[in-house]
Amino acid sequence: APTSSSTKKTQLQLEHLLLDLQMILNGINNYKNPKLTRMLTFKFYMPKKATELKHLQCLEEELKPLEEVLNLAQSKNFHLRPRDLISNINVIVLELKGSETTFMCEYADETATIVEFLNRWITFCQSIISTLT
Protein backbone atom coordinates (compact mmCIF):
# COMPACT_ATOMS: atom_id res chain seq x y z
CA ALA A 1 0.00 0.00 0.00
CA PRO A 2 1.28 3.51 -0.75
CA THR A 3 2.69 5.37 2.23
CA SER A 4 0.70 8.42 3.30
CA SER A 5 2.25 11.86 2.84
CA SER A 6 2.27 12.49 6.60
CA THR A 7 4.12 9.22 7.20
CA LYS A 8 6.63 10.10 4.48
CA LYS A 9 7.19 13.47 6.10
CA THR A 10 7.79 11.83 9.49
CA GLN A 11 10.23 9.40 7.86
CA LEU A 12 12.15 12.26 6.28
CA GLN A 13 12.32 14.17 9.58
CA LEU A 14 13.59 11.05 11.35
CA GLU A 15 16.15 10.56 8.58
CA HIS A 16 17.32 14.14 9.09
CA LEU A 17 17.59 13.62 12.84
CA LEU A 18 19.48 10.38 12.25
CA LEU A 19 21.85 12.16 9.89
CA ASP A 20 22.66 14.83 12.48
CA LEU A 21 23.16 12.29 15.27
CA GLN A 22 25.35 10.09 13.08
CA MET A 23 27.40 13.14 12.11
CA ILE A 24 28.07 13.81 15.77
CA LEU A 25 28.90 10.17 16.47
CA ASN A 26 31.24 10.07 13.48
CA GLY A 27 32.90 13.28 14.60
CA ILE A 28 33.52 11.83 18.05
CA ASN A 29 34.79 8.50 16.74
CA ASN A 30 37.13 10.28 14.32
CA TYR A 31 38.41 12.58 17.00
CA LYS A 32 42.00 11.44 17.41
CA ASN A 33 42.71 13.65 20.39
CA PRO A 34 43.15 13.32 24.16
CA LYS A 35 39.97 15.41 24.51
CA LEU A 36 37.98 12.32 23.53
CA THR A 37 38.85 10.77 26.89
CA ARG A 38 37.51 13.87 28.64
CA MET A 39 34.35 13.85 26.49
CA LEU A 40 33.65 10.31 27.62
CA THR A 41 33.64 11.39 31.26
CA PHE A 42 30.48 13.44 30.73
CA LYS A 43 27.33 11.57 31.67
CA PHE A 44 24.01 11.68 29.88
CA TYR A 45 20.58 10.62 31.04
CA MET A 46 19.03 7.78 29.06
CA PRO A 47 15.28 7.24 28.61
CA LYS A 48 13.73 4.41 30.58
CA LYS A 49 11.61 3.73 27.51
CA ALA A 50 11.95 5.04 23.96
CA THR A 51 9.50 3.52 21.50
CA GLU A 52 7.30 6.42 20.41
CA LEU A 53 7.84 9.90 19.00
CA LYS A 54 6.69 11.49 22.26
CA HIS A 55 9.72 9.95 23.94
CA LEU A 56 11.89 12.40 22.00
CA GLN A 57 11.17 14.70 24.94
CA CYS A 58 13.99 12.82 26.66
CA LEU A 59 16.39 13.69 23.84
CA GLU A 60 15.29 17.32 23.83
CA GLU A 61 16.08 17.68 27.53
CA GLU A 62 19.65 16.47 26.95
CA LEU A 63 20.46 18.72 23.99
CA LYS A 64 22.02 21.48 26.09
CA PRO A 65 24.48 19.12 27.81
CA LEU A 66 25.22 17.61 24.39
CA GLU A 67 26.09 21.04 22.98
CA GLU A 68 28.39 21.71 25.92
CA VAL A 69 30.34 18.52 25.32
CA LEU A 70 30.61 19.25 21.59
CA ASN A 71 31.91 22.73 22.35
CA LEU A 72 34.63 21.11 24.40
CA ALA A 73 35.74 19.12 21.37
CA GLN A 74 36.20 22.18 19.14
CA SER A 75 36.46 19.76 16.26
CA LYS A 76 36.02 20.35 12.54
CA ASN A 77 34.75 16.78 12.25
CA PHE A 78 31.18 17.85 12.97
CA HIS A 79 30.74 19.62 9.61
CA LEU A 80 28.74 22.33 11.39
CA ARG A 81 29.31 24.39 14.52
CA PRO A 82 27.88 22.61 17.60
CA ARG A 83 25.38 25.43 18.13
CA ASP A 84 24.03 25.05 14.59
CA LEU A 85 24.00 21.28 14.81
CA ILE A 86 22.05 21.30 18.07
CA SER A 87 19.72 23.97 16.70
CA ASN A 88 18.97 21.72 13.71
CA ILE A 89 18.27 18.79 16.01
CA ASN A 90 16.06 20.87 18.30
CA VAL A 91 13.88 22.05 15.40
CA ILE A 92 13.41 18.50 14.11
CA VAL A 93 12.69 17.07 17.56
CA LEU A 94 10.01 19.71 18.18
CA GLU A 95 8.39 18.95 14.83
CA LEU A 96 8.43 15.22 15.46
CA LYS A 97 7.17 15.14 19.02
CA GLY A 98 4.89 18.15 18.72
CA SER A 99 5.39 21.34 20.67
CA GLU A 100 2.19 20.82 22.70
CA THR A 101 3.46 17.58 24.19
CA THR A 102 3.17 17.44 27.98
CA PHE A 103 4.97 14.11 28.23
CA MET A 104 7.13 13.80 31.32
CA CYS A 105 10.32 11.95 30.52
CA GLU A 106 11.32 9.04 32.74
CA TYR A 107 15.03 8.35 32.87
CA ALA A 108 16.88 5.13 33.53
CA ASP A 109 18.82 4.86 36.77
CA GLU A 110 22.20 4.52 35.08
CA THR A 111 23.75 7.33 33.08
CA ALA A 112 25.63 6.86 29.81
CA THR A 113 28.61 8.22 27.90
CA ILE A 114 28.06 10.44 24.88
CA VAL A 115 28.73 7.47 22.58
CA GLU A 116 26.16 5.28 24.34
CA PHE A 117 23.69 8.16 24.36
CA LEU A 118 24.03 8.78 20.63
CA ASN A 119 23.84 5.09 19.81
CA ARG A 120 20.61 4.83 21.80
CA TRP A 121 18.91 7.65 19.92
CA ILE A 122 20.21 6.56 16.52
CA THR A 123 18.79 3.10 17.22
CA PHE A 124 15.50 4.71 18.22
CA CYS A 125 15.26 6.70 14.97
CA GLN A 126 16.20 3.74 12.78
CA SER A 127 13.69 1.55 14.57
CA ILE A 128 10.83 4.00 13.99
CA ILE A 129 11.83 4.52 10.35
CA SER A 130 11.74 0.75 9.88
CA THR A 131 8.27 0.45 11.40
CA LEU A 132 6.97 3.26 9.16
CA THR A 133 8.36 1.70 5.96
Epitope: L18, L19, Q22, M23, Q126
Partner: nanobody, 118 residues
Framework: EVQLLESGGGLVQPGGSLRLSCATS????????MGWYRQAPGKQRELVAV???????NYADSVKGRFTISRDNSKNTMYLQMNSLRAEDTAVYYC????????????WGQGTLVTVSS
Protein backbone atom coordinates in the same frame (compact mmCIF):
# COMPACT_ATOMS: atom_id res chain seq x y z
CA GLU B 1 38.31 4.41 3.73
CA VAL B 2 35.25 5.17 1.65
CA GLN B 3 35.02 8.59 0.03
CA LEU B 4 32.11 10.25 -1.72
CA LEU B 5 32.63 12.69 -4.57
CA GLU B 6 29.89 14.94 -5.91
CA SER B 7 29.85 16.41 -9.39
CA GLY B 8 27.43 18.11 -11.76
CA GLY B 9 26.94 21.41 -9.97
CA GLY B 10 27.18 24.76 -11.68
CA LEU B 11 25.36 27.87 -12.77
CA VAL B 12 21.92 27.42 -14.31
CA GLN B 13 19.06 29.74 -15.21
CA PRO B 14 15.71 29.53 -13.40
CA GLY B 15 13.61 26.78 -14.95
CA GLY B 16 16.70 24.89 -16.03
CA SER B 17 17.94 21.42 -15.11
CA LEU B 18 21.03 19.83 -13.59
CA ARG B 19 22.00 16.28 -12.75
CA LEU B 20 24.20 15.75 -9.74
CA SER B 21 26.23 12.58 -9.33
CA CYS B 22 27.73 11.07 -6.20
CA ALA B 23 30.45 8.51 -6.87
CA THR B 24 32.04 6.40 -4.16
CA SER B 25 35.68 5.41 -4.05
CA UNK B 26 34.96 2.18 -2.21
CA UNK B 27 32.17 -0.28 -1.75
CA UNK B 28 28.97 1.23 -0.41
CA UNK B 29 26.77 -1.74 0.35
CA UNK B 30 23.44 -1.71 -1.44
CA UNK B 31 21.75 -1.83 1.97
CA UNK B 32 23.05 1.60 2.95
CA UNK B 33 20.65 4.52 2.98
CA MET B 34 21.87 7.35 0.75
CA GLY B 35 20.70 10.88 0.24
CA TRP B 36 21.29 14.51 -0.62
CA TYR B 37 21.16 17.50 1.68
CA ARG B 38 21.86 21.14 0.96
CA GLN B 39 23.23 24.09 2.86
CA ALA B 40 22.56 27.67 1.81
CA PRO B 41 24.38 30.53 3.56
CA GLY B 42 22.58 31.59 6.73
CA LYS B 43 19.95 28.85 6.42
CA GLN B 44 19.27 25.60 8.23
CA ARG B 45 20.64 22.52 6.54
CA GLU B 46 17.86 20.87 4.51
CA LEU B 47 17.55 17.19 3.74
CA VAL B 48 16.42 17.17 0.12
CA ALA B 49 16.05 13.55 -0.94
CA VAL B 50 16.69 10.06 0.43
CA UNK B 51 16.83 6.61 -1.13
CA UNK B 52 16.87 3.45 0.98
CA UNK B 53 18.79 0.29 0.20
CA UNK B 54 15.55 -1.17 -1.12
CA UNK B 55 15.01 1.79 -3.44
CA UNK B 56 12.29 3.61 -1.47
CA UNK B 57 12.54 7.34 -2.06
CA ASN B 58 11.50 10.37 -0.04
CA TYR B 59 11.63 14.08 -0.81
CA ALA B 60 11.38 17.40 0.98
CA ASP B 61 8.15 19.22 0.15
CA SER B 62 10.18 22.04 -1.39
CA VAL B 63 11.52 19.78 -4.17
CA LYS B 64 8.73 17.23 -4.59
CA GLY B 65 7.79 16.77 -8.23
CA ARG B 66 10.91 18.58 -9.42
CA PHE B 67 13.81 16.46 -8.12
CA THR B 68 14.37 12.74 -8.60
CA ILE B 69 16.85 10.65 -6.62
CA SER B 70 18.18 7.36 -7.97
CA ARG B 71 21.08 5.01 -7.40
CA ASP B 72 23.05 2.50 -9.44
CA ASN B 73 24.50 0.00 -6.99
CA SER B 74 26.54 -1.72 -9.70
CA LYS B 75 28.37 1.58 -10.31
CA ASN B 76 28.37 2.67 -6.66
CA THR B 77 26.82 5.93 -7.80
CA MET B 78 23.80 7.97 -6.76
CA TYR B 79 22.12 10.71 -8.75
CA LEU B 80 19.90 13.74 -8.20
CA GLN B 81 18.03 14.94 -11.27
CA MET B 82 16.95 18.53 -10.63
CA ASN B 83 14.35 20.07 -12.93
CA SER B 84 12.46 23.38 -12.89
CA LEU B 85 15.19 24.92 -10.77
CA ARG B 86 14.44 28.04 -8.73
CA ALA B 87 16.60 30.72 -7.16
CA GLU B 88 15.84 29.25 -3.73
CA ASP B 89 17.50 25.97 -4.80
CA THR B 90 20.87 27.75 -4.75
CA ALA B 91 23.06 25.97 -2.20
CA VAL B 92 25.95 23.61 -1.71
CA TYR B 93 24.63 20.07 -2.23
CA TYR B 94 26.17 17.19 -0.28
CA CYS B 95 25.62 13.50 -0.77
CA UNK B 96 25.84 11.05 2.10
CA UNK B 97 25.69 7.34 2.75
CA UNK B 98 24.96 5.79 6.11
CA UNK B 99 24.86 2.37 7.68
CA UNK B 100 21.45 1.33 8.96
CA UNK B 101 22.96 -0.92 11.65
CA UNK B 102 25.69 -0.39 14.26
CA UNK B 103 28.36 0.99 14.21
CA UNK B 104 26.32 3.55 12.22
CA UNK B 105 29.14 4.65 9.90
CA UNK B 106 28.39 7.81 7.97
CA UNK B 107 30.14 9.10 4.88
CA TRP B 108 29.59 12.39 3.09
CA GLY B 109 31.21 14.33 0.30
CA GLN B 110 32.78 17.76 0.04
CA GLY B 111 29.78 19.24 -1.72
CA THR B 112 29.01 20.76 -5.11
CA LEU B 113 27.69 24.29 -5.56
CA VAL B 114 24.46 24.81 -7.46
CA THR B 115 23.67 28.41 -8.39
CA VAL B 116 20.32 29.26 -9.95
CA SER B 117 20.40 32.76 -11.37
CA SER B 118 19.52 34.66 -14.51
Amino acid sequence: EVQLLESGGGLVQPGGSLRLSCATSGTIFSGYTMGWYRQAPGKQRELVAVISGGGDTNYADSVKGRFTISRDNSKNTMYLQMNSLRAEDTAVYYCYSREVTPPWKLYWGQGTLVTVSS
